[in-house]
Interface confidence: low
């Protein structure tokens, strides 16, 4: 190889050893018969050189620097041509490497031809190899500002006092071109200046100078980017850290169009802005920072471009105004992420707000919008609280759980609408009064509504699901002893058209004991099937509920249980059964964890069934499903 | 306050498959990523993979693609790991662990499941 | 990927001394380095992220330091409870790696 530098080039060349490898066999620069590890060519010199070994690109690397003087004389602006070319060098991963000195009072513009240029942050790499590393300077100080692939969004990175401009080439890449130009510009007054220019959808992840290190105290960074007009951009923070300011705030500021608030200033834990139309400028500034505990300031961000949906432009109302202690959350449905650029699914507050979840709080009115490519991606869970403090004035009261008919105008689904029913320890109960009659969700007879009541324990301390309860059966009522939480959850979009069938009644009424007690009037057309709560986990410790199964006068009963034997083992007190008929009091005790349970029985009148828990074995629980089925009397038993 | 609570010991024959599972309660799940550890007996930590809690989108260590599977469900707060056509080196302590979903630390640990493969 | 080598793998000490833990990375990793304690039978336990940030209920006797790819961990005193297994942790690209751990103990 021959490589000659002329006089007034200001290039130097160093071919070094690049990272170790562990190749067993060494390889050297061989120059006149002397062998070097390291060869420096400097401007006017011409050295002829080869390698001892037949793949020197797994040992060296090559460095072309060319420092660029505008402080003494005129700027070679323009395109910026790779020399020597590369046709000239050993096949060695290259860097070239521009360093450009000139006045604090020139702005200094690295242009980028397409493709442009996209950023990447800490342990990341560019896929064919090709990377770009720009830094500036802040008087003697260097400041990175970042390093790019191809194929981005990145056009123009303007600086000021200076650019050192690196590229890097993997040995077998054939580029014989920069890609970049430089122009002079007058004086940004801040670090630099990025443009980032969209043509369509797409993301773009931009960094502060110096990621992940610290941005310099008390310095501006601007990033302006270019949004065809037909879309919409927001804004994401996906890192961020302050430091210690003593003066000042770091902030980020918007100029947004159409905004009569610019610049529109954010703090770094703000949710940024979405939504936005036209082209903007974002702005990170620093503070001057504690001397003794600095701290850093570093922001990574994602801008995600896309096409405004029907929805996005349409404004829902939701009146919160009247409510008390109700949270409305619209968010992300879980779902599998592809590979391939997914466009975000944003919910927007006063339009401008945007995020990929947003929680309503009561005692407003509230508009929203969506920016979403497929509404069915999102959907709503409320949570209500109804809780009474004082047990004289709550007695008798009664509210009505239903999903306010406002939600229904929103074009997203709705998941759960959760009531949590609050009552005073040991002095008030609650009773659910369904509109229609309901279901006990079981394997045996699973519901197939569009939505159910899923009730459940809301003490924390108390694992206690009574079950899913669904429209279409013999359930009148549900009494329950203390805190529950109510959830209607829905399963399909139809829920829109059966929403009629929706609706419960709690009413607080005096304390009781037992955990739960159902009051069933069995339907003469089918089975009904019922079972203990926390099916599955088992009945909790000591816990007692009961079911009272009303039996018309014509009709006689036949409870049946599932299994034998219920397979409980206490490891302390006694599980038991207690069947009881209510008309005459009479009554049979069955011991759980002994006895087997009875056979199949029939009931001419109106009866209770109780069970107790002892404190089981751990995977020896109590879980018991029985089923009541009722036929016409033939002779009357009176 | 947070916990993070996984299931119990599993003891299983080579070429089963087991599913762990790990449910956080004291915070919201989605606004965290979840992170799986394994231990191997009287070796030290590995990292295996973590999954959005927002998206559902697990990313796994290069060792643990193919029978590893995360996955989620939002709506009773727990993660899981499945593990399928089980071997013997796969005999290990399995964490679950709170992080971010960037530069993440793991504030807080599941207590660990033991998973015992022999035949 | 980034591979974090710990020494000493043994460190025997008294209580009341000064313990100093290392953790070296196979390229710069920044600050993107936390630090954990693991005592038989418990899980990890989280005491010092990005290299030296502290941790709220961790003992102020436990302290980091460094950035690059030099780290280290420091117990000005070492108490009986701390007698443990500590092992640190990248988090500076996937896939996040842990150091091979160093055993703490009692001399």
């Known amino acids: 190889f021959e490589i000659a530098l002329p006089r007034e080039s200001n290039i130097t060349v160093l071919i070094k050893l690049g990272t170790p490898t562990l190749l067993a066999k060494p390889c050297y620069i061989v120059i006149s018969k002397r062998h070097t590890t390291m060869l420096s060519i400097k401007p006017g010199e011409r050295i002829l050189f080869t390698f001892s070994c037949q793949s020197p690109e797994n040992h060296f690397v090559i460095e072309i620097q060319k420092n660029i003087d505008c402080m003494s004389g005129p700027c070679p602006f323009g395109e910026v041509q790779l020399q020597p070319s590369t046709s000239l060098l050993p096949t060695l991963n290259r860097t070239f490497i521009w360093d450009v000195k000139a006045h604090k009072s020139i702005g200094l513009e690295l242009q980028f031809s397409i493709p442009r240029l996209r950023q990447f942050g800490p342990g990341e790499s560019c896929p064919d190899g090709v990377t770009y590393s720009i830094s500036g300077r802040i008087d003697a100080t260097v400041v990175r500002i970042g390093t790019f692939c191809s194929n981005g969004t990145v056009s123009r990175i303007k600086m000021q006092e200076g650019v050192k401009m690196a590229l890097h080439l993997p040995w077998f890449h054939p580029r014989n071109v920069s890609g970049f130009s430089i122009a002079n510009r007058s004086s940004i007054k801040r670090l630099c200046i990025i443009e980032s220019v969209f043509e369509g959808e797409g993301s773009a992840t931009l960094m502060s100078a110096n990621y992940p290190e610290g941005f310099p105290e008390d310095e501006l960074m601007t990033w302006q980017f270019v949004i065809p007009a037909h879309l919409r951009a927001s804004v994401s923070f996906l890192n961020f850290n302050l430091s210690n300011c003593e003066r000042k705030e770091e902030r980020v500021e918007y100029y947004i169009p159409g905004s009569t608030t610019n610049p529109e200033v954010f703090k770094l834990e703000d949710k940024q802005p979405g939504n936005m139309a036209g082209n903007f400028n974002l702005s990170l500034q620093g503070c001057d920072q504690d001397a003794q505990n600095p701290g850093i300031l570093r922001l990574q961000f994602q801008v995600l471009v896309q096409h405004p949906q029907n929805e996005s432009n349409k404004i829902y109302v939701v009146d919160l105004s009247n409510e008390r202690a109700t949270s409305l959350t619209i968010e992300p449905r879980p779902v599998k992420q592809s590979r391939k650029f997914v466009p975000g699914c944003f919910v927007c507050l006063e339009s401008r707000t945007c995020s990929t979840n947003l929680t309503l709080t009561s005692g407003s009115k509230h508009k929203i919008s969506f920016l979403c490519d497929n509404l069915t991606r999102l959907w709503m869970n409320v949570e209500k609280n109804i809780s009474c403090t004082d047990h004289r004035y709550c007695q008798r009261k009664s509210y009505s759980l239903q999903v306010p008919s406002d939600i229904f105008h929103l074009p997203v689904e709705l998941h759960d609408f959760s009531w949590k029913l609050l009552v005073p320890k040991d002095r008030l109960s609650l009773v659910l009064v369904p509109a229609q009659k309901l279901q006990q969700h079981t394997h045996e007879k699973p519901c197939n509504t569009s939505f159910s009541y899923l009730v459940a324990s809301a003490i924390p301390s108390q694992d206690l699901y009574f079950g899913s309860f669904c429209p279409g059966g013999s359930i009148e009522q549900i009494q329950v002893k203390q805190n529950i939480s109510v959830t209607l959850r829905t399963f399909a979009p139809s829920f829109r058209q059966e929403a009629s069938r929706q609706g419960l009644t709690v009413s607080f009424i005096p304390y009781f004991k037992e955990e739960g007690v159902f009051t069933v009037t069995p339907d003469t057309k089918s089975k009904v099937y019922l079972r203990t709560p926390n099916w599955d986990r088992g009945l909790p410790s000591l816990t007692s509920v009961s079911w009272n199964i009303s039996v018309p006068r014509d009709q006689v009963a036949c409870l049946t249980f599932f299994k034998e034997r219920t397979g409980v083992v206490c490891q302390t007190g006694r599980a038991f059964m207690i069947i009881q008929e209510q008309r005459t009091r009479a009554e049979e005790i069955f011991s759980l964890d002994e006895d087997a349970l009875p056979k199949p029985r029939f009931h001419h009148h109106s009866f209770w069934v109780n069970i107790s828990n002892c404190s089981p074995a751990s995977g020896k629980q109590l879980d018991l499903l029985f089923w009541v089925t009722l036929t016409p009397r033939t002779v009357d038993l009176t | 306050q947070v916990q993070l609570v996984q299931s119990g010991s599993e003891l299983k024959k080579p070429g089963a498959s087991v599913k762990v599972s790990c449910k956080a309660s004291?915070?919201?799940?989605?606004?965290?990523?979840m992170h799986w550890v394994r231990q191997a007996p009287g070796q030290g930590l590995e990292w295996m993979g973590w999954i959005n809690t927002e998206t559902g989108a697990p990313t796994y260590a290069d060792d643990f693609k193919g029978r590893f599977v995360l996955s989620l469900d939002t709506s009773v707060s727990t993660a899981y790991l499945q593990i399928s056509s089980l071997k013997a080196e796969d005999t290990a302590v399995y964490y679950c662990?709170?992080?971010?979903?960037?530069?993440?630390?793991?504030?807080?640990w599941g207590q660990g499941t033991l998973v015992t493969v022999s035949s | 990927e980034i591979v974090l080598t710990q020494s000493p793998a043994t460190l025997s000490l008294s209580p009341g001394e000064r313990a100093t833990l290392s953790c070296r990375a196979s390229?710069?990793?920044?600050?993107?380095l936390h630090w954990y304690q693991q005592k038989p039978g418990q899980s990890p336990r989280l005491l010092i992220k990005?290299?030296?940030q502290s941790i709220s209920g961790i003992p102020a006797r436990f302290s980091g330091s460094g950035s690059g790819s030099d780290f280290t961990l420091t117990i000005s005193s070492v108490e009986p409870e701390d007698f443990a297994v500590y092992y640190c942790q990248s988090a500076h690209s996937f896939p996040y790696t842990f150091g091979q751990g160093t055993k703490l103990e009692i001399k």
């Open positions: 990005y290299a030296s």
């Open positions: 390229q710069s990793i920044s600050d993107f």
């Open positions: 662990s709170r992080g971010r979903d960037y530069d993440p630390h793991f504030d807080y």
């Open positions: 004291g915070y919201t799940l989605t606004d965290f990523s």
